[in-house]
Interface confidence: low
């Protein structure tokens, strides 16, 4: 069956790294420079991705695979296949239209990317603050005072149901 199909379509014989050249009687021609074909039987080669500006080349383009980009120092990748480079900030900061800004009081960011998120509210889980939060670190919750007093139940009641906070990045 495969052989019959290849007789009907000579292009199916062209391997990755080549294209079926209609201008040359459907001969398999190598992909031109800066182009590739990752599968066989293709009638054109795709243009290689160029890693320019804030993008830098992580993997060079070959005749059978596209180039892969990452970001120059001070930037980080976002999106599938590093479709975006976003400026790094320091821990304790977030990126805004005006550049990197310190997290407001009551919020933190422990990464070089993303947004400042509110400190955990320990009291919602019936706990107390063991270690105070900073711009770079969340608070650390400890056992509630009631848990430490004699005669307290060892069964912790479930936390009240609440909508998880969104912090898209």
């Amino acid at each position: 069956f495969e052989r019959t199909r290849s007789l009907q379509d000579p292009c199916s014989n062209c391997p990755a790294g080549t294209f079926c050249d209609n201008n040359r009687n459907q001969i398999c021609s190598p992909c031109p420079p800066n182009s590739f074909s990752s599968a066989g039987g293709q009638r054109t080669c795709d243009i290689c991705r160029q890693c320019k500006g804030v993008f830098r080349t992580r993997k060079e383009c070959s005749s059978t695979s596209n180039a892969e980009c990452d970001c120059t120092p001070g930037f980080h990748c976002l999106g599938a296949g590093c479709s975006m480079c976003e400026q790094d900030c320091k821990q304790g900061q977030e990126l805004t239209k005006k550049g990197c800004k310190d997290c407001c009081f009551g919020t933190f960011n422990d990464q070089k990317r993303g947004i400042c998120r509110p400190w955990t509210n320990c009291s919602l889980d019936g706990k107390s603050v063991l270690v105070n939060g900073t711009k770079e670190r969340d608070v650390v919750c400890g056992p509630s005072p009631a848990d430490l007093s004699p005669g307290a139940s060892s069964v912790t009641p479930p936390a009240p149901a609440r909508e998880p906070g969104h912090s898209p990045q």
Partner: antibody
């Protein structure tokens, strides 16, 4: 009055290149994020690329990644889109728009330019 | 295929109320990203109609309202008028794609 005016569209052969420009006026261009959005004839809207106020954050749709390059010149209040290796499916009206980004959960486009038509055909 | 799903068409008679839906997923609307709506009159550029789920820019009549719940959003137009005949698009941000995404658009016909 806030205004955006695109230029640079036209007829180009497959594999060719074009550079679109968008001249901004009536607002502080240098502190606003900007985007390009396109609309193929009779089709819907597709976000193409976006750039932050200082070019520190740049993004592309998968369909144009590696072929298109967005840039801006804040001293000239102008946004650019360099389009290489053009394909028939890139035929569309290209709009530039101010991207009102509220980092975290919201971004919207307002205002929009009138658009410039790019036709890729042999 | 658009990342956000809208009905291709909707219709109503003058004075009626019509609703246009926009359905997304856990990487866009469901992730907490806001939804915005645009009106595109024939032969013109899109115009912002609703931003941040329910806010109206100045100059947009209060006949237009927006809402969002879970992974979907809606645009409602009350007291339908002939000049409302246009294409309507929803838009949000997608964390998986790291970019803005649009619905396929809904053509509103005023009968």
């Amino acid at each position: 009055e806030v205004q955006l005016l695109e230029s640079g569209g036209g007829l180009v052969q497959p594999g060719g290149s074009l550079r679109l420009s968008c001249a901004a006026s009536g607002f502080t261009f240098s502190s606003n994020e900007m985007s390009w959005v396109r609309q193929a004839p009779g089709k819907g809207l597709e976000w193409v690329s976006g750039i932050s106020w200082n070019s520190g954050s740049i993004g592309y749709a998968d369909s144009v990644k590696g072929r298109f390059t967005i840039s801006r010149d804040n001293s000239k209040n102008t946004l650019y889109l360099q389009m290489n290796s053009l394909r028939a499916e890139d035929t569309a009206v290209y709009y530039c728009a101010r991207d009102r980004m509220v980092r975290g959960v919201s971004n919207w486009f307002d205002p929009w330019g009138q658009g410039t038509l790019v036709t890729v055909s042999s | 295929q658009s990342v956000l799903t809208q009905p291709p068409s909707a219709s109503g008679t003058p004075g009626q109320r019509v609703t246009i839906s926009c359905t997304g997923s856990s990487s866009n609307i469901g992730a907490g990203y806001d939804v915005n709506w645009y009106q595109q009159l024939p032969g013109t550029a899109p115009k912002l109609l609703i931003y941040g789920n329910f806010n109206r820019p100045s100059g947009v009549p209060d006949r237009f309202s927006g809402s969002k719940s879970g992974t979907s959003a809606s645009l409602a137009i009350s007291g339908l008028r002939s000049e409302d005949e246009a294409d309507y698009y929803c838009q949000s941000y997608d964390s998986r794609l790291s970019g803005s995404v649009f619905g396929g658009g809904t053509k509103l016909t005023v009968l």
